[in-house]
Amino acid sequence: QGWQAFRNDATEVIPGLGEYPEPPPENNQTMNRAENGGRPPHHPYDAKDVSEYSCRELHYTRFLTDGPCRSAKPVTELVCSGQCGPARLLPNAIGRVKWWRPNGPDFRCIPDRYRAQRVQLLCPGGAAPRSRKVRLVASCKCKRLTRFHNQSELKDFGPETARPQKGRKPRPGARGAKANQAELENAY
């Protein structure tokens, strides 16, 4: 049922664009219009435990499509990737190292907060351009899964799995503090 495993139809990944090594910066400014009405950032684990986690934020850039229309500019997206702990390395029978979680809680690297970005779509045949707001991942987190979580949260969150099911719309996730305006404006 989840949206993270799916994306809009026909996308075009542009190699070499937007492959930033660092995650986007956070903006800690006070939210001003609704007295901190935004959802607070999520802190799923203590700082001392961070070394046990490897939830990565990968960037890739692509054009978006909506039916026959295509975004005027490519959009840089963030994809959540990697394993989450707490986990420890154990050698397996043939000497290789593998992750092992002994009957513990299942943690996954999934989107934490989302942001909207305006996208202008150009359409063929002289049709009028369209303006849409696209839902983009703003940050990732390691989240403990329970049996109540959606099946989608058990999937990998990368561009390879980012395809919609026919007749289904992908689904959003939580969002928190105000998105970085510079990131919104300079995403291209």
Partner: antibody, heavy 121, light 109 residues
């Protein structure tokens, strides 16, 4: 499929406050952009405020600024709209409405059944 | 704050075509106002017909279409049916703020 179920009708005295709830099922509340809209008897729709995903914050209509508070309890997937300093002209049906999820934002796709708030002395 | 204007009432014959418009006190309505159109029948909650100027929903009858016409958002109903008699509201986004129009009472007779 998102479903929104609102709390029951309320009768309040002028000057009092009312808190209307909107229980989300089908999705979790944190996955949706919630807005509140009201409609006075025989009148049109009036937007009160809602979550702006572009700015990452809740925005209130200027008319209700300082008098309305929109909150969320993500543990119970319930949104709340509290309106204070009630006056007779606040008598209306209050609706919660959310987007449908999705890669492209489509707001106001799902509506609660409405909560009638009557302000009368 | 911006004011969004609609025709207070319109009448269309069954099978006929009618266009409802949605204007802004701030000037021309563009795709960046993300016009929405809603249908509301007595005693019911509103129902979204059109999002983002022209985007129909799975439940939107094909006879409804959205566009921009002459600096306004427009909802065109082609081949009106008796069940289309209702109140129609438009909505425009001004940044993060939302403003509804006053509504158009559409009569089919």
């Amino acid at each position: 499929e998102v479903q929104l179920v609102q709390s029951g009708a309320e009768v309040k005295k002028p000057g009092a406050s009312v808190k209307v709830s909107c229980k989300v099922s089908g999705y979790t509340l944190s996955e949706l952009s919630m807005h509140w809209v009201r409609q006075a008897p025989g009148k049109g729709l009036e937007w009160m405020g809602g979550f702006d995903p572009e700015g990452g914050e809740t925005i209130y209509a200027q008319k209700f600024q300082g008098r309305v508070t929109m909150t969320e309890d993500t543990s119970t997937d319930t949104a709340y709209m509290e309106l204070s300093s009630l006056r007779s002209e606040d008598t209306a049906v209050y609706y919660c409405a959310t987007d449908a999820g999705g890669y492209w934002y489509k707001f106001f796709q799902h509506w609660g059944q409405g909560t009638l708030v009557t302000v009368s002395s | 704050q911006a004011v969004v204007t609609q025709e207070p009432s319109l009448t269309v014959s069954p099978g006929g075509t009618v266009t409802l418009t949605c204007g802004s006190s701030t000037g021309t309505v563009t795709i960046d106002h993300y016009p929405y159109w809603f249908q509301q029948k007595p005693g019911q909650a509103p129902r979204t017909l059109i999002s983002d100027t022209d985007d129909k929903h799975s439940w939107t009858p094909a006879r409804f279409s959205g566009s921009l016409l002459g600096g306004k958002a427009a909802l065109t109903l082609s081949g009106a049916q008796p069940e289309d008699e209702a109140e129609y509201y438009c909505l425009l986004f001004y940044g993060g703020t939302v403003v509804f129009g006053g509504g158009t009472k559409l009569t089919v007779l």
